[in-house]
Interface confidence: low
């Protein structure tokens, strides 16, 4: 039959070359004369003249060594043809098929590979896949297929075998627990791949294995017993810097300590922070200190760290022993700020109150007292019993000194330690209003006409409070009722001035008196203008010479 | 201040042995990895030798089996013991602070280093 | 080993002019899991110790005047002296730390043209 099967040809024959394949025969060769070519890539076409035919017997021939990694199956057609050139068959398929030699050694992708892991992880913990590729045949032989091998671990330490890998995907794991960071941060493992499955040729790569920071190591302070020297009622003072030492990473959350007062601090006296750089914990005073209260405080404070601990650590503990100082504390007026009420003006040298201060000091200090700022210069102050006096005139309505009706002083206490300290205190008088002031018109000058004059609108003010103010009432005194009528509009506390007879253009007095609900009464003299002109005028036409 | 003082160079014949020192002050040697490296006279630099914070150790393939790298901690002092001295030996001897422990410190590379000392081996 | 090359071996440059030093390795320096290239720059002058001036390639050491950059990823490095001055006269190595054994490379010498 015109028909040849799969033809098998090693890769890098040794020839000799053409060596014979396979011969192609047709069983038309009885009747005629038979003439055979090939044609295909390999053959005709790229690459050229690997394959030949004998024209007249048919044998197939290989021209040169193959290289299955190049080409591994030719695909060419056999033709027959009769002497006067008709073909005789049908096209004929020819599969040659390279078969493979182990010519290729493996290849790793990379000349150094990285990988990390935890420290302290348990065996079978992957890290890192390795590859190497080779070119020969994998699937009909063992010629390219890779085992994976460990040759050496650099540093040795716990010891040799630290890590395995897998022969057939190249995975790298630990293989024994004692990965520790803080002896051994880094792996250099030499490994190997090697062809036929581990029989044959072999090239090596570097795996690089950093060994990650895991927060085995707890802090331990170093001392753990601290005394410290505080002086009393000093917030935010530095109290003592605790050390601890921790053999994880440095400035990494498993270094980082996390400090707590775990006892001795009930009145919550004490606070505690870490430093950025240092890692020490900083003892700080959040309130001040009482000596006279305490004068002993014993702290204990833990330490941990930022991240959780992977195992059971024991938690160190330090304890630091305070001893406040005794300071000479000023005193301190009881209550800090005092209000006292008063009536105004009351006379000179009148007691208004007694303010005296309290010394937090144990021995029995003597205080003497005296007025610090007094703007007025209203009060006095006995030095030895702290007494308050008149000493001015209190003006409720002296609005330079006084506001709502408060007088604000500032007052000194001084004791007699070594050195002495001040304390002050403050005094606000509340000034009870008396009826000091009569009621007052604005303004005082007015602009009227002599013929159908408008009337004048003034208003009543009256420093006093009330009751001590409206109602009010007017009356016009000194024969100022001949010309003028006055009269109060209780509404809008004003009083309306009128013309009431005809008076020629001149300026008058019109003398006025307000009185208050209390009856106090303030005479005032209004400057009436009164010009020749009809109704309404703000100033006496042209010409006027005035007397 | 970090300084590091190398000592301990000198004139040895080949195959004899010497021992450098290094000693460091203004950071506590075993918080840091610690290199040797070298420089033959008018060539570059070659890394020699590391030792790890925890001890472990690496070197480089060309001293690997003659060198050994040490420290002593209560005397803040590293060691680089030499055995079988050889001519191509000959440099200038560096001891170099790694950057930090830590590989994210950059630890590879190295911030402060010794003004060095020569080591001579010829016979 | 990792195989550092720099170029030029040397090269001589006016004060105030820009400078830039090549450096190739042999492998990529870049460590895909944390996105850094382990590479640093030393400069080394006459009869001193080296001076780390730039690490992950591109991060000055502190105290290291901002117109020494460096630059490059994977397997291409650069260091660039912006404004070149008489002081900068030196040798200057890269340096892999990305595997055992660290490596440098033969060294660049810059002189004043």
């Known amino acids: 039959d015109w028909v040849v099967a799969p033809i098998s040809v090693p890769e890098n024959g040794k020839g000799p070359f053409p060596q014979r394949l396979n011969q192609l025969k047709s069983n038309k060769d009885r009747d005629t004369k038979i003439f055979y070519s090939i044609t295909g890539p390999g053959a005709d076409s790229p690459p050229e003249g690997v394959f030949a035919v004998e024209k007249e017997t048919g044998w197939l021939l290989l021209n040169k060594p193959l290289d299955r990694e190049e080409i591994a199956k030719y695909e060419l057609f056999g033709h027959a043809v009769s002497e006067n050139g008709a073909s005789v068959e049908d096209p004929m398929n020819i599969s040659i098929i390279v078969t493979d030699q182990n010519d290729h050694k493996p290849k790793f992708t990379q000349d150094t590979f990285r990988g990390s892991v935890l420290e302290g992880v348990l065996p079978g913990t992957s890290v890192m896949q390795v590859t190497a590729t080779d070119e020969d045949d994998a699937i009909h032989t063992y010629n390219g297929v890779v085992a994976y091998s460990i040759h050496s671990q650099e540093p040795k330490d716990p010891h040799d075998l630290m890590f395995t890998i897998h022969r057939s995907t190249g995975t790298i794991s630990v293989i024994s627990s004692g990965l520790d960071r803080e002896k051994v941060p880094e792996y250099t493992l030499t490994i190997q791949a090697t062809d036929m499955d581990g029989d044959g040729s072999t090239t090596t790569a570097v795996a690089v294995v950093e060994i990650l920071d895991a927060n085995d190591n707890a802090p331990v302070f170093d001392p753990q017993k601290y005394e410290s020297h505080v002086p009393e009622n000093a917030v935010g003072h530095e109290v003592q810097r605790l050390t601890v030492t921790d053999l994880d990473a440095p400035n990494s959350p498993a270094w980082r300590a996390t400090y707590l007062i775990v006892g001795g601090d009930d009145g919550d006296h004490f606070t505690i922070a870490t430093h950025p750089e240092s890692n020490q914990g900083i003892l700080t005073t959040r309130k001040g200190l009482d000596f006279e209260a305490k004068n002993q405080h014993t702290l204990y404070v833990e330490v941990t760290n930022e991240a959780p601990f992977v195992l059971k650590l024991p938690t160190s503990t330090a304890t630091i022993v305070v001893h406040v100082e005794d300071v000479n504390e000023a005193p301190v007026f009881v209550p800090p700020s005092k209000v006292v009420e008063v009536q105004e003006g009351i006379p000179t040298g009148e007691a208004v109150c007694v303010y005296t201060a309290k010394d937090p000091d144990k021995e029995n200090q003597k205080i003497s007292y005296r007025i610090l700022r007094d703007p007025a210069g209203w009060l006095a102050m006995d030095p030895d019993s702290g007494q308050v006096t008149v000493a001015g005139t209190l003006d409720r309505e002296d609005e330079r000194f006084v506001r709502n009706n408060i007088y604000e002083v500032m007052v000194l206490a001084v004791d007699n330690g070594s050195p002495p300290t001040t304390g002050t205190g403050t005094l606000l008088l509340t000034l009870i209003d008396v009826n000091d002031h009569g009621p007052v018109p604005e303004p005082r000058e007015i602009t009227i006409c002599n013929q159908s004059p408008e009337s004048q609108v003034l208003n009543i003010t009256d420093k006093d409070l009330s009751p001590h103010t409206s109602p009010f009432q007017a009356q016009l005194t000194d024969d100022s009722d001949i010309y003028w009528m006055a009269e109060v509009n209780e509404k809008d506390d004003t009083v309306v001035l009128s013309l009431k007879k005809f008076l020629k253009q001149d300026t008058y007095d019109v003398h006025l008196s307000l009185s208050d609900h209390g009856n106090k009464e303030q005479l005032t003299v209004i400057r009436a203008t009164v010009c020749d002109c009809h109704g309404h005028v703000e100033k006496c036409p042209d010409p006027w010479k005035g007397g | 201040e970090v300084q590091l003082l190398e000592s301990g160079g000198g004139l040895v014949q080949p195959g004899g042995s010497l021992r450098l020192s290094c000693a460091v002050s203004g950071f506590t040697l075993s918080s840091y990895p610690i290199n040797w490296v070298r420089q033959a006279p008018g060539k570059g630099l070659e890394w020699v030798s590391v030792?790890?914070?925890?001890?472990?150790?690496n070197y480089a393939s060309s001293v690997k089996g003659r060198f050994t790298i040490s420290r002593d901690n209560s005397k803040n002092t590293l060691y680089l013991q030499m055995n079988s001295l050889r001519a191509e030996d000959t440099a200038v001897y560096y001891c170099a602070k790694s950057r930090g422990v830590y590989d994210f410190d950059g630890r590879g590379a190295m911030d402060y280093w010794g003004q060095g000392t020569l080591v001579t081996v010829s016979s | 080993d990792i195989v550092m090359t720099q170029s030029p071996d040397s090269l001589a440059v006016s004060v105030g002019e820009r400078v830039t030093i090549n450096c190739k390795s042999s492998?990529?320096?870049?460590?895909?899991?944390?996105?850094?290239?382990?590479l640093a720059w030393y400069q080394q002058k006459p009869g001193q110790p080296p001076k780390l001036l730039i690490y992950w390639a591109s991060t000055r050491e502190s105290g290291v005047p901002d117109r020494f950059s460096g630059s490059g990823s994977g397997t291409d490095f650069t260091l660039t002296i912006s404004s070149l001055q008489a002081e900068d006269v030196a040798v200057y190595y890269c340096?892999?730390?990305?595997?055992?054994?660290?490596?440098f490379g033969q060294g660049t010498k810059l002189e004043i043209k």
């Open positions: 340096q892999q730390y990305y595997s055992y054994p660290y490596t």
């Open positions: 492998q990529s320096l870049l460590y895909s899991s944390n996105q850094k290239n382990y």
């Open positions: 030792i790890w914070t925890g001890g472990g150790t």
